[in-house]
């Protein structure tokens, strides 16, 4: 039975041309996680597995990197990075649990005016 | 080359109890979940229950809940099964086996098993 | 919990014999089926893993499908050192259990 929860930072937004952490952790589950992957929409970012460690899709290694921890930081935001993004994680035995992070990129003037949640 | 070696052979009497070792070398310890197997004589497979070796959480089968315990020594690269209060139907041979993180988890390496005889 | 039902629990075939196991699932498990071979006296090896997915190293003479809920292992060519006792093991949830295993004896 999957008894765990997957915790994200919900909806964020973040200023064109900056950076944002997107953040996902799973809980409530004795579960072991044996690999982390990263989508938006039906895209693939990024892997990270226990054993072979990080995987960045190539057309995302200029602008994609690692962590912190088991999220993925997104560099050089640009308008059409606004969307779903979405952490699986896949689970010794529980299977896979998915989380759902809503980025809106904003033109830096209305940014600099709209709520903005980051991570410390 | 990923390698499970395991303890010797036990013969215990009645009452005592019996600790199994799994010696893990070829790969990380900690990035593999663990499991347990019985096979009694002349029987079949059962599965134990499995240890979270990220964080040392064990989690038993039904029929495994009461005098069994898994754990691990990550310094030494080793997981245990330690037996209390043994029964003659404890007899059976012991393995110990790794997790695959594919996305299916099946045992891709096995221990050699160890025979642990209850007999007064 | 989920029960396997493995069949069938002895057979007996000659050298070159196609041979078929089945594995039923009391209920959907999807792909997450492994197949595993024990020789007497020896731990378990891992034949087949996702239902239809050949473990490196193993002969080619082995397969594994699904349909719905049953799952067949086949031997397409038995040798002699295919003597040993077949597991199936479902693998999608806690508890993880194995069918009760088919005896292969060569005649």
């Known amino acids: 039975m999957m008894t765990g929860t997957i915790e994200t930072t919900g909806n964020i937004s973040a200023e064109k041309g900056g950076s944002i952490i997107l953040q996902c952790h799973l809980s409530s589950t004795t579960a072991q996680v044996t690999q982390v992957n990263w989508e938006q929409q039906d895209q693939l970012l990024a892997i990270c597995n226990a054993d072979l460690g990080w995987h960045i899709s190539p057309s995302f290694k200029d602008r994609v990197a690692p962590g912190p921890g088991l999220g993925l930081t997104l560099q050089s935001l640009t308008v059409n990075d606004t969307g779903e993004y979405f952490c699986i994680y896949h689970t010794y035995p529980d299977g896979a649990y998915t989380g759902r992070i809503f980025l809106e990129v904003l033109e830096s003037s209305v940014a600099e005016h709209g709520a903005r949640f980051q991570i410390p | 080359e990923v390698q499970l070696v395991q303890s010797g052979s036990e013969l215990k009497k009645p009452g005592a109890s019996v600790k199994v070792s799994c010696k893990a070398s070829?790969?990380?310890?900690?990035?593999?979940?663990m499991n347990w197997v019985r096979q009694a004589p002349g029987r079949g497979l059962e599965w134990m229950g499995w240890?979270?070796?990220?964080?040392?959480?064990?989690a038993y089968a039904q029929d495994f809940t009461e005098r069994f315990v898994f754990s691990l020594d990550t310094s030494v690269t080793t997981a245990y099964l330690q037996i209390s209060s043994l029964k003659a139907e404890d007899t059976a041979v012991y393995y110990c086996?790794?997790?695959?993180?594919?996305?299916?988890?099946?045992?891709?390496?096995w221990g050699q098993g160890t025979l642990v005889t209850v007999s007064s | 919990d989920i029960q396997l039902t493995q069949s069938p629990s002895f057979l007996s075939a000659s050298v070159g014999d196609r041979v078929t196991i089945t594995c039923r699932a009391s209920?959907?498990?999807?792909?997450?089926l492994a197949w595993y071979q024990q020789k007497p006296g020896k731990a378990p090896r891992v034949l087949i893993y996702?239902?239809?997915t050949l473990q490196s190293g193993v002969p080619s003479r082995f397969s594994g499908s699904e349909s719905g809920t049953e799952f067949t292992l086949t031997i397409s060519s038995l040798q002699p050192e295919d003597l040993a006792t077949y597991y199936c093991?479902?693998?999608?949830?806690?508890?993880?259990?194995f069918g009760q295993g088919t005896k292969v004896e060569i005649k």
């Open positions: 996702g239902a239809t």
């Open positions: 070829g790969y990380t310890l900690t990035n593999y979940p």
């Open positions: 086996a790794r997790t695959a993180i594919t996305s299916v988890y099946h045992f891709d390496y």
């Open positions: 240890i979270n070796t990220n964080t040392g959480s064990p």
């Open positions: 209920q959907g498990i999807s792909s997450y």
């Open positions: 093991q479902k693998l999608n949830s806690h508890p993880s259990s």
